[in-house]
Interface confidence: medium
Amino acid sequence: VPQKPKVSLNPPWNRIFKGENVTLTCNGNNFFEVSSTKWFHNGSLSEETNSSLNIVNAKFEDSGEYKCQHQQVNESEPVYLEVFSDWLLLQASAEVVMEGQPLFLRCHGWRNWDVYKVIYYKDGEALKYWYENHNISITNATVEDSGTYYCTGKVWQLDYESEPLNITVIKAPREKYWLQ
């Protein structure tokens, strides 16, 4: 049975600033055919037929659900892209993370401007701070890492706060054990 394809993002963030670029790639098993990929944005078929969909100079209307399909194989699970205009944007490697998997958070400044005195918060409580911008890296996520995250920082000497982001860590599905 052919596997469902999977949409990946490069850079890996599904929350980006207006004007930024992101490439969505449709990955699957043995899909070597050229021009055989269908892309759907908010349910509408895109003109793009390559296995990569490039979003250049992102606009607000690029926000929404993306799915891909190879030949007549099932559609991929949806990936949701959000385009923002703000001073700070908290980006996550994933908003739903399997327990034991890594989680990366990034406090991203508008136009890639330097952000100083970056403080990450979880459920309203400061997690960690740095004088310069710094990503937070959680090597093995646990259910306790679930929560509402945001960051604050200085851009051009003024203090800003990102919109909150909900992160959910789900338990890995338990393997079935069969009695011999």
Partner: antibody
Framework: EVQLVQSGAEVKKPGESLKISCKGS????????IGWVRQMPGKGLEWMGI????????TYSPSFQGQVTISADKSISTAYLQWSSLKASDTAMYYC????????????WGQGTMVTVSS | QSALTQPRSVSGSPGQSVTISCTGT?????????VSWYQQHPGKAPKLMIY???KRPSGVPDRFSGSKSGNTASLTISGLQAEDEADYYC??????????FGGGTKLTVL
């Protein structure tokens, strides 16, 4: 009251090991970086390194990298500075200091620990 | 990572003003606003007097002021008082979670 209380003065011989401590109270110890500063007799302040007790993330001054080890035990709100083999030139007053991200400075200092290394 | 450069000593009479300079590089003083000044009396721990170049913590008299131009920061003490006699150290963030201190300046109130 926010304070850092350091362990008492030490007199050691060259080659011996030592671990001095800095206990924080009156604030959430795991949430603020703690720095260590050396002051040799009659000399100025030298920044040695810093630790974030929440996850033991540590950064050293190049001058002190490999010479000392900075650690922390968050369960007892204590940071440590240790030597595996002391030298006479380690004779100094050592201060721990709490970093404050809102002032970009070390706002609270321990009283200092005098370490004397002599044969 | 070299120490910031401060004058060895300065002096002034009560009521006068004195300024202590602190020269670094674009990698420390010139590159960040995180410049602090500490006062240290003999046998005591340092005390924060100025942070973020020019801000005073509560309890520090407004006779103490700070400024910065390029790679040089300055501490000015106006209306000198006898209790101001102490050693003064500047400090700057130097990137990648490292700091650097100045060599210290001995202030004598004549």
């Amino acid at each position: 009251e926010v304070q850092l209380v350091q362990s008492g003065a030490e007199v050691k011989k060259p080659g011996e090991s030592l671990k001095i401590s800095c206990k924080g109270s009156g604030y959430t110890f795991t949430k603020y970086w703690i720095g260590w500063v050396r002051q040799m007799p009659g000399k100025g302040l030298e920044w040695m390194g810093i630790i974030y007790p929440g996850d033991s993330d540590t950064t050293y001054s190049p001058s002190f990298q490999g010479q000392v080890t900075i650690s922390a035990d968050k369960s007892i709100s204590t940071a440590y500075l240790q030597w595996s083999s002391l030298k006479a030139s380690d004779t100094a007053m050592y201060y721990c200091a709490k970093d404050n991200p809102f002032t970009g400075s070390f706002d609270i200092w321990g009283q200092g620990t005098m370490v004397t290394v002599s044969s | 990572q070299s120490a910031l450069t401060q004058p060895r000593s300065v002096s002034g009479s009560p009521g006068q003003s004195v300024t202590i300079s602190c020269t670094g590089t674009s990698n420390d003083v010139g590159g960040y606003t995180y410049v602090s000044w500490y006062q240290q009396h003999p046998g005591k721990a340092p005390k924060l007097m100025i942070y973020d170049v020019s801000k005073r913590p509560s309890g520090v008299p407004d006779r103490f002021s700070g400024s910065k131009s390029g790679n040089t920061a300055s501490l000015t003490i106006s209306g000198l008082q006898a209790e101001d006699e102490a050693d003064y150290y500047c400090s700057s963030y130097a990137g990648s979670y490292t700091w650097v201190f100045g060599g210290g300046t001995k202030l004598t109130v004549l």
